[in-house]
Amino acid sequence: LPAQVAFTPYAPEPGGTCRLREYYDQTAQMCCSKCPPGQHAKVFCTKTSDTVCDSCEDSTYTQLWNWVPECLSCGSRCSSDQVETQACTREQNRICTCRPGWYCALSKQEGCRLCAQLRKCRPGFGVARPGTETSDVVCKPCAPGTFSNTTSSTDICRPHQICHVVAIPGNASMDAVCTSTSPTRSMAPGAVHLPQPVSTRSQHTQPTPAPSTAPGTSFLLPVGPSPPAEGSTGD
């Protein structure tokens, strides 16, 4: 016969553990229900009654199944050099990231302390390594046969067009100028092949930053009573 399903609260078997989305309450010595994300424990369980959960108040949240007495405070509003990429809800903290064209130069435990503007590569130099959420752009000189004519944090060195008849030879900061009407693109060493035409203006595409948590927050649950034996009490 299948084992009877126990309804919370219940006493675990000796040496046993509580089930998923339950926790062991040391005071009641029972397995009790956790509260879902967006809620917190308003009343802890007893031997005869289960946990009573309540919704998080405005500007507070819980992201995990939990038994915290109070929801966590969302981080303060994003500073002027950052943008809110995720709003504070009952189930998630606010997430702030640096504005487009900026990167997190000085991080802190959660989020970014100071954003700085990305460097750009000048004509004759292309992006060797694009900027990320936490690192600046790295530039490199355009190799022979390639050029960049922009000041950009995204543009790479591109191959000179190959001319049947060259009017003006290309250099690191200028494409070749042809007298014929049908130039082709070379595949110069180190050049990146681009399947479609690239505008000579900077594209201004930004690296997609990995989100950072707004300041003053933590996802850690309080250290609660231990179950009788180690086991999964998480999601």
Partner: antibody, heavy 125, light 109 residues
Framework: QEQLVESGGGLVTLGGSLKLSCKAS????????ISWVRQAPGKGLEWIAY????????DYATWVNGRFTISLDNAQNTVFLQMTSLTAADTATYFC??????????????????WGPGTLVTVSS | IKMTQTPASVSAAVGGTVTINCRAS??????LAWYQQKPGQPPKLLIY???DLASGVPSRVKGSGSGTEFTLTISGVRCDDAATYYC????????????FGGGTEVVVK
């Protein structure tokens, strides 16, 4: 030749307004951010505002309190500083400045490598 | 971030060495620049990223430090070095009130 030149300074009465211009030449204007920095007679440098042409974003020092507005005209390669409710404390030489273009191929907007000669603004009662 | 420069004024003999200090109110790693300004002229960038020499600046000018403490050292002082020197952090945004230090006047005797 990379160059910034300010204009529009002069004598203005207390509480009045003035619009300064900063004309850029020889630079990739739409990719270069421009700041305004001022210096009162015999005093230090004070950063005022910044405009980032390719993102259209602006920043102001906390003390500006909405009295100054930075803007740009991309077609004319010019950045403006509109100043209102001027006081004697605003008497200064106003510089426009742009980032540092290094010989190793970087344009770094964090530092000011290119400056205009400045334009003097005098606020009198 | 507030930048504090010391001393306000310093004198040096020709051929000597001048040291100027700049303290940031919080850690700015190496995001710091030094400028030289002579009367009637705009500032000139000397050092960026705390220790990198700007184009055309002689090697007798040296920047050092990181975090909150920074130093500008000019060795083999010449008459031409008489000027006011400023430090600047690289984070000018709408959170900024003080971007530059107060300045240090260098008098060459």
């Amino acid at each position: 030749q990379e160059q910034l030149v300010e204009s529009g300074g002069g004598l203005v009465t207390l509480g009045g307004s003035l619009k300064l211009s900063c004309k850029a030449s020889g630079i990739d204007f739409s990719s270069y951010g421009i700041s305004w920095v001022r210096q009162a007679p015999g005093k230090g440098l004070e950063w005022i505002a910044y405009i980032y042409p390719d993102y259209g974003s602006t920043d102001y020092a906390t003390w500006v309190n909405g009295r100054f507005t930075i803007s740009l005209d991309n077609a004319q390669n010019t950045v403006f500083l509109q100043m209102t409710s001027l006081t004697a404390a605003d008497t200064a030489t106003y510089f426009c400045a742009s980032g540092y273009a290094s010989s190793s191929g970087y344009y770094d907007p964090k530092y000011f490598g290119l400056w205009g000669p400045g334009t003097l603004v005098t606020v009198s009662s | 971030i507030k930048m504090t420069q010391t001393p306000a004024s310093v004198s040096a003999a020709v051929g000597g060495t001048v040291t100027i200090n700049c303290r940031a109110s919080e850690d700015i790693e190496s995001y710091l620049a030094w400028y030289q300004q002579k009367p009637g002229q705009p500032p000139k960038l000397l050092i960026y990223d705390a220790s990198d020499l700007a184009s055309g600046v002689p090697s007798r000018v040296k920047g050092s430090g990181s975090g909150t403490e920074f130093t500008l050292t000019i060795s083999g002082v010449r008459c031409d070095d008489a000027a006011t020197y400023y430090c600047q952090h690289g984070f000018y945004t709408s959170r900024s009130d003080s971007v530059f230090g107060g300045g240090t006047e260098v008098v060459v005797k």
